[in-house]
């Protein structure tokens, strides 16, 4: 079957890292400088992706595989095979068109990518709020007042104190 | 080409459940932030519930908090909406859309650039 | 209530302009983009504008979108029948944790 598929067309005997040359009487040629395939029984070769810029080189180009690139520090990776390159914040901070703006207040981030998320809310769990939130963390919640044993008290603190500029909007 | 087809609406009785799929073709679907967006009868656009890439951060408008779940499948391309405890309120056309390619960003802030054809949910007795 | 506030209705002939105006606070409109969005009755909205400014390939330059603080406006020139639609302003609200729409304005071309 391969003899008769190489009978029928010659390129597919071509390796990756090779082309199937048109202007040779399609022999199989390697792949020029800075491009690639990365299959078989290609008629041309890919150009590599530079990694320029914002962005970093993960891995090198070779004449089988593209390069592969990631960002510089302080920026982290969007999309598929890291098509864009965005902004860190610090943790309790999100990425606004105005730049890194601390979470609002009710919400927090303990990532430096992403957006503020809300505190979880203890009580839809019937359970009570242990420790308070911050913008960088989470509340943690504990024992619902129910579960505590008697003559135990609920360790629910008061409300926290609005920090500056994080007042309800 | 890059589309997103809706199944799953219906006519459902008060206090009753519903799941809506959104499957998706045509662009990187792990890499997209996904929302519902619902307009009920001779209203306007209401967003429902948001979710990230990777699947790991869900948000919700306070009108379904506790009673609808957002979830997606990336090996099937599919996003979902899980609804319960559902009221006439509920009622509307409810949409999916792709909110761009990037993967921690924002739910709305690039746009939602492609919809699913809207499919209808029907709450009554 | 929404809490991105739109008017209700706008109109102008054929060939005009049209601006649509969309205020919301500093949590949504003031601090994170907008998009605009354009509703033929029946079907799915369409993306006009995202980040604040930007057109999708395939939507003429006859849609712009600007802000200023916490308003965006959307600017239709040259108004053709076709572009008579509803048009929805959306935001991401940070205090909210929520995504946000205006309550939609109805474009009539005279």
């Known amino acids: 079957f391969e003899r008769t598929r190489s009978l029928q067309d010659p390129c597919s005997n071509c390796p990756a890292g090779t082309f199937c040359d048109n202007n040779r009487n399609q022999i199989c040629s390697p792949c020029p400088p800075n491009s690639f395939s990365s299959a078989g029984g290609q008629r041309t070769c890919d150009i590599c992706r530079q990694c320029k810029g914002v962005f970093r080189t993960r891995k090198e180009c070779s004449s089988t595989s593209n390069a592969e690139c990631d960002c510089t520090p302080g920026f982290h990776c969007l999309g598929a095979g890291c098509s864009m390159c965005e902004q860190d914040c610090k943790q309790g901070q999100e990425l606004t068109k105005k730049g890194c703006k601390d979470c609002c207040f009710g919400t927090f981030n303990d990532q430096k990518r992403g957006i503020c998320r809300p505190w979880t809310n203890c009580s839809l769990d019937g359970k009570s709020v242990l420790v308070n939130g911050t913008k960088e963390r989470d509340v943690v919640c504990g024992p619902s007042p129910a579960d505590l044993s008697p003559g135990a008290s609920s360790v629910t603190p008061p409300a926290p104190a609005r920090e500056p500029g994080h007042s309800p909007q | 080409q890059v589309q997103l087809v809706q199944s799953g609406g219906g006519l459902v009785q008060p206090g009753g459940s519903l799941r809506l799929s959104c499957a998706a073709s045509?662009?990187?679907?792990?890499?997209?932030?996904m929302s519902w967006v619902r307009q009920a009868p001779g209203k306007g656009l209401e967003w429902v519930s948001g979710?990230?890439?990777?699947?790991?951060?869900?948000y919700y408008a306070d009108s379904v908090k506790g009673r609808f779940t957002i979830s997606r499948d990336n090996s099937k391309n599919t996003l979902y909406l899980h609804m319960n405890s559902l009221t006439a309120e509920d009622t509307a056309v409810y949409y999916c859309a792709s909110g761009g390619n990037y993967g921690s960003g924002t739910i709305v802030s690039h746009g939602m650039d492609v919809w699913g054809q809207g499919t209808t949910v029907t709450v009554s007795s | 209530q929404s809490v991105v506030t739109q008017p209700p209705s706008v109109s102008a002939a054929p060939g005009h302009k049209v601006t649509i105006s969309c205020s919301g606070n500093s949590s949504n409109v003031g601090r994170n983009y907008v998009s605009w969005y354009q509703q033929v009755p029946g079907t799915a909205p369409k993306l006009l504008i995202y980040d604040d400014n930007k057109r999708p390939s395939g939507i003429p330059d006859r849609f712009s979108g600007s802000t200023s603080g916490a308003s965006a406006t959307l600017v239709i020139t040259g108004l053709q029948t076709g572009d008579e639609a509803d048009y929805y302003c959306?935001?991401?609200?940070?205090?909210?944790?929520?995504?946000?729409f205006g309550g939609g304005t109805k474009l009539t071309v005279l």
């Open positions: 979710i990230s890439g990777s699947g790991d951060s869900a």
């Open positions: 959306g935001a991401w609200d940070s205090s909210l944790s929520a995504g946000v």
């Open positions: 045509g662009f990187t679907f792990s890499s997209s932030a």
